[in-house]
């Protein structure tokens, strides 16, 4: 991100809307760090490759994270 900045968080807006795990291309979780004091979750949707930041505090998003980690643990040997 360019320009004068206070902290290096990249999410300007966040979505609280439920996301269907099947519509997800990719889910990036960026932990809080010295650069950004909050966890950032960036969802890339299969349709058009649209990227959105998700609200880590939202119940719907917490459920999504659980569903995704369950799916991953099923796939891993």
């Amino acid at each position: 991100v360019p320009l004068s900045r206070t902290v290096r968080c990249t999410c300007i807006s966040i979505s609280n809307q439920p996301v269907n795990p099947r519509s997800l291309e990719k889910l990036e979780i960026i932990p809080a760090s010295q650069f950004c004091p909050r966890v950032e979750i960036i969802a890339t949707m299969k349709k058009k490759g649209e990227k959105r930041c998700l609200n880590p505090e939202s119940k719907a998003i917490k459920n999504l994270l659980k569903a995704v980690s369950k799916e991953r643990s099923k796939r891993s040997p």
Epitope: C9, S15, C36
Partner: antibody, heavy 121, light 110 residues
Framework: QVQLVQSGGGVVQPGRSLRLSCAAS????????MHWVRQAPGKGPEWVAV????????YYADSVKGRFTISRDNSKTTLYLQMNSLRSEDTAVYYC??????????????WGRGTLVTVSS | QFVLTQPPSVSGAPGQRVTISCTGS?????????VHWYQQLPGTAPKLLIY???NRPSGVPDRFSGSKSGTSASLAITGLQAEDEADYYC??????????FGGGTKLTVL
Amino acid sequence: QVQLVQSGGGVVQPGRSLRLSCAASGFTFNSYGMHWVRQAPGKGPEWVAVISYDGNSKYYADSVKGRFTISRDNSKTTLYLQMNSLRSEDTAVYYCARDSGSYLDWYFDLWGRGTLVTVSS
Amino acid sequence: QFVLTQPPSVSGAPGQRVTISCTGSRSNFGAGHDVHWYQQLPGTAPKLLIYGNNNRPSGVPDRFSGSKSGTSASLAITGLQAEDEADYYCQSYDSRLGVVFGGGTKLTVL
């Protein structure tokens, strides 16, 4: 009703200060980044600044860096622009605008009606 | 002054098709950033017309369409109507500058 209601414009002398306000209603204000965009008479829009949904991240255009400060009060669902050391070239209609929510691709899906700031001696 | 380049004016008769071009650079369109278009009627705030290169917000007629290729983009208006007379601005995100706009194109319906 989803809207942005602006206030605080007027005539001000060069070197003086002014604060603009933008009251939001009808949407979840604390989920959206908010921008200020200005438009000089007869010219195209010029982006001024953005603030993240929680107020933690702020970015400014070079032309206002060090003079303007963007802030927000989520409890009052209001966005602010503090403008210091005003210059004649800051004369413009100032719009507040809601960020679209698209990651790293800032654009504006809701605009206020604008408030005129005239910097003149 | 404006990072994105648009023609100052275009015109067309009612019912005709007109296009408005918008030329960017490597740090905006060339870096994969989308183009967005706004319509500004006299004395009003800009209104989002096209987002993400070719998507219309609800309420925008399908006479309006957008496209982007490389460092160029365009807005097409078919079946031109008197109420389309307005200023049109392209906008993108620039990895060096943040939000950038075109200088605007005045559309005159003859």
